[in-house]
């Protein structure tokens, strides 16, 4: 039975040209956490953290994607195009697959405002 | 049934390199991640790197850094594994070994290679 | 990284025997941990992971336990065909590490 929650950024926004940290957080499980996927809004993979074998980010981004902090994901350099959703995927045994979503909108504006309050979706 | 076949034994130089490699025979690399052990004579086990070959990343052990780089052909579906530098202290058995990704990632390394046979003499 | 250190290095037994294996990590590994047996000039085959789950085709007599920083890998009766070494490996952590082994011979 999946007793566990993800809790994530929600609804966040950056200043082009800036950083923004992505971040989801699995609670009320005792479940391992085997590996976390991050996926963009078309669904194709940023990066993977495995237990065992470390961070792994896809070569296209390995130059605006840093891992962490912990199982979060730092997107660098942004860029309009980086406006979108994310999903941050946990695979865990025995429960089986969460998934959090995060809506990321990169603003033109120098005073955008950089919200982060966790919010479960 | 998916095996992994690796490349026949070695004997090398000190100072040499040696490239192993180890083909996937029946399946594809696709949702898995290949491990490199290596075990010397009368020895445990020991872990040496990791490619995740959707990706082509690969991450190593402190102790092999700089000296060994792993690499993958998805479209052939092999694995290799190249030591450089290399010194007595080398000789050993190498293996490749499967990895599940996501889903399955609670797996340990599942599949095995045969094992290639390194030996450094001069 | 990670040590592991298993206990004893290596046993005697006779079929039917009741053998217990056991595996300490220099920290807490949760059930982030596998056990491998190993026959002389063969690979590894994984037996357990997740500190206690059986792998497909692995015989029942085979059970693993524990958590955090204490594991067991227990045979409940000895088989000719189990006499091997066994390795312990955690998992928690980049980059694995395994035990230095226990080799289970004939008594």
């Known amino acids: 039975m999946m007793t566990g929650t993800i809790e994530t950024t929600g609804n966040i926004s950056a200043k082009k040209g800036g950083s923004v940290i992505l971040q989801c957080h699995l609670s009320s499980t005792m479940a391992q956490v085997t590996q976390v996927n991050w996926e963009q809004h078309d669904h194709s993979l940023l990066a993977i953290r495995n237990a065992e074998l470390g961070w792994h980010i896809y070569p296209a981004f390995k130059d605006r994607v840093a891992p962490g902090p912990g199982l979060g994901l730092t997107l660098q350099s942004l860029t309009m195009n980086d406006t979108g959703e994310y999903f941050c995927t946990y695979h865990t045994y025995p429960d089986g697959t969460y998934r959090g979503r995060i809506f990321l909108e990169v603003l033109e504006s120098s005073v955008a405002e950089h919200s982060a309050r966790f919010q479960i979706p | 049934q998916v095996q992994l076949v690796q490349s026949g034994a070695e004997v090398k130089k000190p100072g040499s390199s040696v490239k192993v490699s180890c083909k996937a025979s029946?399946?594809?690399?696709?949702?898995?991640?290949i491990s490199w052990v290596r075990q010397a004579p009368g020895q445990g086990l020991e872990w040496m790197g990791v490619?995740?070959?959707?990706?082509?990343?690969?991450n190593y052990a402190q102790k092999f850094q700089g000296r060994v780089t792993v690499t993958a052909d998805e479209s052939t579906s092999t694995a290799y594994m190249e030591l450089s530098s290399l010194r007595s202290e080398d000789t050993a058995v190498y293996y490749c070994?499967?990895?599940?990704?996501?889903?399955?990632?609670?797996?340990?390394?599942?599949?095995w290679g045969q094992g290639t046979t390194v030996t450094v003499s001069s | 990284d990670i040590q592991m250190t298993q206990s004893p290095s290596s046993l005697s037994a006779s079929v039917g025997d009741r053998v217990t294996i056991t595996c300490r990590a220099s920290?807490?590994?949760?059930?982030?941990l596998n056990w491998y047996q190993q026959k002389p000039g063969k690979a590894p085959k994984l037996l357990i992971y997740?500190?206690?789950s059986l792998q497909s085709g692995v015989p029942s007599r085979f059970s693993g336990s524990g958590s955090g920083t204490d594991f067991t890998l227990t045979i409940s009766s000895l088989q000719p065909e189990d006499f091997a070494t066994y390795y312990c490996?955690?998992?928690?952590?980049?980059?694995?590490?395994f035990g230095g082994g226990t080799k289970v011979e004939i008594k």
């Open positions: 920290q807490s590994i949760s059930s982030y």
């Open positions: 490996q955690q998992r928690y952590v980049f980059p694995p590490t």
């Open positions: 070994a499967r990895l599940h990704l996501g889903q399955k990632a609670y797996y340990g390394m599942d599949v």
């Open positions: 029946g399946g594809t690399f696709q949702n898995y991640a």
């Open positions: 490619i995740v070959p959707i990706f082509g990343t690969a």
């Open positions: 997740a500190a206690s």
